[in-house]
């Protein structure tokens, strides 16, 4: 007499929600006499999935006609799969007996895992901007996928990054999983136009990974370089002071002119010129009348960029000795 073998050929079955799942089971012998039942799980708390003789299993159909005399195929099909159906399914042979049939042999089991696509990755940057040469963190999140195996890569302007840490939760068995990855990026002054991309590859995506992006422009602050120039005196004792604010980002910038410590003008950057790297330049002029000055004038330009502490740049306008004499005469 040939020893009975219970064959469940698939170790793993991936099924999408709403689909039907076929769980295959064949036996190699008709003996001993007795039914084949399907269970999910093991141990005393296992769940009966199908019993041909008794019970009501509306979502389960048999692949073959179990009433046929020499039937050896006990495969079943479960319709309208839901996340609650995930688990390991066993076909189990029972030997006919009384007062109950006796469990004789179990198949090795088929794990049914839900095939669910990951959500579109969402990349979020740091809460506050940082300046070049500093490191910022970007986080990528995706959820709702199954099975657990997933691949995540980071890119900066198309170049793969290596400094990142990824976690898939939960660690144990679950209906679906989520992934969270944090990449560390060192900022460069030209990164205003740079982009980081998080790429997620999963069995459900048929080789077409999902991507989420974030612009480094949201994370970077390039502080301005400041330059003050003084144009030669014009007729009428006027001096043109030019203040050039170069290579800054973002564009919110406020400039205050102070004459001997007193505010004489405040302006917000408006007509900016954009550089190729995405940073901005801005030029501000101040016309100073020196005819009524008897002492040297200290001109200070105060720049407040993106809410940071103000940066000052001062220039001393020297009044000629002739002017000083004239003004001192006038005061006597």
């Amino acid at each position: 007499e040939e020893e009975l073998q219970m064959i469940q050929p698939e170790k793993l079955l991936l099924v999408a929600v709403g689909e039907s799942a076929t769980l295959n089971c064949t036996v190699t012998s008709l003996l001993p006499v007795g039914p084949v039942l399907w269970f999910r799980g093991v141990g005393p708390g296992r769940e009966l999935i199908y019993n041909q003789k008794e019970g009501h299993f509306p979502r389960v159909t048999t692949v073959s006609d179990l009433t046929k005399r020499n039937n050896m195929d006990f495969s079943i099909r479960i319709s309208s799969i839901t996340p609650a159906d995930a688990g390991t399914y066993y076909c189990v042979k029972f030997r006919k007996g009384s007062p109950e049939n006796v469990e004789f042999k179990s198949g090795p089991g088929t794990e049914m895992a839900l095939r669910a696509k990951p959500s579109a990755p969402v990349v979020s940057g740091p809460a506050a901007r940082a300046t070049p040469e500093h490191t910022v963190s970007f986080t990528c999140k995706s959820h709702g996928f199954s099975p657990r195996d997933i691949t995540l890569k980071w890119f900066k302007n198309g170049n793969e990054l290596s400094d990142f840490q990824t976690n898939v939760d939960p660690a144990g068995q679950s209906v679906s999983y989520s992934i969270r990855s944090t990449a560390r990026v060192v900022l460069a002054p030209w990164d205003v136009r740079s982009q980081v991309t998080c790429e997620v590859a999963h069995v459900t995506l048929q080789g077409d990974p999902l991507r989420g992006t974030a612009n480094l422009s949201e994370a970077i602050r390039v502080p301005p370089t400041l330059e003050v120039t003084q144009q030669p005196m014009r007729a009428g004792n006027q001096v043109n002071i030019t203040y050039q604010v170069r290579n800054f980002y973002p564009q919110n910038l406020q400039l205050t002119w102070l004459e001997n410590g007193n505010v004489c003008r405040t302006e917000t950057a408006s007509t900016l010129t954009e550089n190729k790297d995405g940073t901005y330049n801005w030029t501000s002029w101040l016309l100073v009348n020196t005819s009524d000055q008897r002492d040297d004038v200290v001109l200070t330009c105060q720049v407040k960029h993106d809410g940071q502490l103000a940066v000052n740049k001062s220039l001393v306008l020297e009044v000629s000795a002739h002017q000083k004499d004239q003004s001192s005469d006038a005061t006597h």
Partner: antibody
Amino acid sequence: QVQLVQSGAEVKKPGASVKVSCKASGYTFTSYYMHWVRQAPGQGLEWMGRINPNSGGTKYAQKFQGRVTMTRDTSTSTVYMELSSLRSEDTAVYYCARLGSAYFDLWGRGTLVTVSS
Amino acid sequence: DIQMTQSPSSLSASVGDRVTITCRASQSVDTWLAWYQQKPGKAPKLLIYEASTLESGVPSRFSGSGSGTDFTLTISSLQPEDFATYYCQQANSFPITFGQGTRLEIK
């Protein structure tokens, strides 16, 4: 050969618990349910319950419900029967017996449990 | 629970005699009935199962019959080794139950 080897005789005080073992050999342990039957001195046979060696599922006689626990260790092909809150009426020979389709075709030699103060 | 009643409770007979023991169930057990022989200090030994099937290795002088509620065990010609206690057992439904036993003694 096909046999069931039980643990040795036990003497217990009232209120105590006893755990009897039964080691199967010579056949596929998981293909037969194991039952426990006891016999008080000079009395008949009394069915106590059974264990499914595959799943560990149990079924107990109403009389012993709450006092008896049957377990198994598939790695050693051994089943255990633990009876708690012992009283003098529990003095008996305890047998493990393999159930064929509806009959006990293989028996252990029995374990005498004496409950005495 | 299904009650199993054996009769007689004890009986004396001689070697060579034909002996019949009866077992009555309180409700039908179909043919899910077995007979066992037990000798002092030993475990029971299966003789007959499913009412009439002789267990392998059991002498053919033992036979069983009946279905539903009434069953008999017959020993056609008693041998000295047959003196023992005999039990019937039903396996139609839980709990499994045994008869109280019939003690067969030498006359």
